[in-house]
Interface confidence: medium
């Protein structure tokens, strides 16, 4: 709305840099040929790039990553009744950050 | 995968809590009957509430929120030529996370 | 303050019953699993049952299977262990503990234990 | 049924390192956890999932798990670590214990 202005405090653009994220473990991460299982924990976070860029054409992308494997409890559920395994996750984390010329395909001619 | 075990760290859960999160203003939360203007900035931060509990049956909720009014700048574009105005958008930031139990709704019988 | 307090513990003659009873206090009892560990004078600990957060999954070490039956009662934050068929080598002491998960883990809680003895 | 192996006993000078094996058939395949009992008194946890120290242990105590072994370090050990430590893990559907190891810290 265009009204109370005078207690808004001017918007700060979120810059284009790594956050604290949280990314889900999904079950196909660790065995894409079974769904009698869980997954614990089922999130960790992650540094990920976000925010924007100063120019409509720039995104925000990393610019340097690195892969992080973490061990995770793998929970089959036999008869009703648990056995733990380790298993290993390999997140994804963002070390820095860019803003990047968008790349559009030219239409061919 | 259940391999190489040995450089992987223990998974820690991303815990319920407040973070940082970035926020995009869409066009519409300032006009929705015109789509002929800009908004700067595009995205600002804003504190969300994520993570997981340590249940199944609860979820990360925000047990506290606080409206924060922002200004923004409203650039239309007439005859090819920007004119700048204020608007204000109403940000929601979350102040404090807890893990609420899911209400699954009951079958009726 | 978070704590377990063990009660129930006793003299009973070999072949008798006796039921513990645990109360959680200070966390949310219905969102963690809970264990029985005992310790036989002057021994180690021994693994004795799990519930899990909701009491659907419960399971027993071999040595009490048949006998020992676990439960609990949410409404009332407590945790149950109804033993039967007593024998001498079921003297121990007794103790409730809390794993941090639904699934179980490690036990982060413990209680400072009730004493159970059967001798004739 | 699974079982867990640790020495009855492990002797150290204060302020050495003290470390504590617990073995077990793929024992680096379960995730292992460490607890301190002193004599009277309940168990308390010190190191969880092979390496994890809760909240208020002191940082003197760390662990690890691979192959066979799981080991429990106590670096610059101090006359308040001399207790009994047993390792457990979670395997087919119990919870399994070691028979414990006694720490003493010579004087």
């Known amino acids: 709305s265009l009204g109370s202005l005078a207690a808004a405090e001017p918007a700060v653009i979120a810059e284009c840099k790594t956050r604290t994220e949280v990314f889900q473990i999904s079950r196909n991460l660790i065995d894409r040929t079974n769904a009698n299982f869980l997954v614990w924990p089922p999130c960790v976070e992650v540094q990920r790039c976000s925010g924007c860029c100063n120019n409509r054409n720039v995104q925000c992308r990393a610019s340097q990553v690195q892969m992080r494997p973490v061990q995770v409890r793998k929970i089959e559920i036999v008869r009703k009744k648990p056995i733990f395994k380790k298993a290993t996750v390999t997140l994804e984390d963002h070390l820095a950050c860019k803003c990047e010329t968008i790349v559009t395909p030219r239409p061919v001619t | 995968s259940l391999g190489s075990l040995a450089a992987a760290e223990p998974a820690v859960i991303a815990e319920c809590k407040t973070r940082t999160e970035v926020f995009q203003i869409s066009r519409n939360l300032i006009d929705r009957t015109n789509a002929n203007f800009l908004v700067w900035p595009p995205c600002v931060e804003v504190q969300r509430c994520s993570g997981c509990c340590n249940n199944r049956n609860v979820q990360c909720r925000a047990s506290q929120v606080q409206m924060r009014p922002v200004q923004v700048r409203k650039i239309e574009i007439v005859r090819k030529k920007p004119i700048f105005k204020k608007a204000t958008v109403t940000l929601e930031d979350h102040l404090a996370c807890k893990c609420e139990t899911i209400v699954t709704p009951r079958p009726v019988t | 303050e978070v704590q377990l307090v063990e009660s129930g513990g006793g003299l009973v003659q070999p072949g008798g019953s006796l039921r513990l009873s645990c109360a959680a206090s200070?966390?949310?009892?219905?969102?963690?699993?809970m264990s029985w560990v005992r310790q036989a004078p002057g021994k180690g600990l021994e693994w004795v049952s799990y519930?899990?957060?909701?009491?659907?999954?419960?399971y027993y070490a071999d040595s009490v299977k048949g006998r020992f039956t676990i439960s609990r009662d949410n409404s009332k934050n407590t945790l149950y262990l109804q033993m039967n068929s007593l024998r001498a080598e079921d003297t121990a002491v007794y103790y409730c503990?809390?794993?941090?998960?639904?699934?179980?883990?490690?036990?982060?809680?413990w209680g400072q234990g009730t004493l159970v003895t059967v001798s004739s | 049924s699974y079982e867990l192996t640790q020495p009855p006993s492990v002797s150290v000078a204060p302020g050495q390192t003290a470390r504590i094996s617990c073995s077990g058939d793929?024992?680096?395949?379960?995730?292992v956890h460490w607890y301190q009992q002193k004599p009277g008194q309940a168990p308390v946890l010190v190191i969880y999932?092979?390496?994890n120290r809760p909240s208020g242990i002191p940082e003197r105590f760390s662990g690890s798990n691979s192959g066979n072994t799981a080991t429990l370090t106590i670096s610059g050990t101090q006359a308040e670590d001399e207790a009994d430590y047993y390792c457990?893990?979670?395997?087919?559907?119990?919870?399994?214990f070691g028979g414990g190891t006694k720490l003493t810290i010579k004087r």
């Open positions: 200070g966390f949310t009892f219905s969102s963690y699993a």
């Open positions: 503990a809390r794993h941090p998960y639904w699934y179980g883990g490690q036990l982060d809680l």
């Open positions: 999932d092979d390496s």
């Open positions: 519930i899990s957060d909701d009491g659907s999954l419960k």
């Open positions: 457990s893990a979670f395997t087919h559907n119990s919870d399994v």
């Open positions: 793929s024992l680096g395949s379960y995730f």
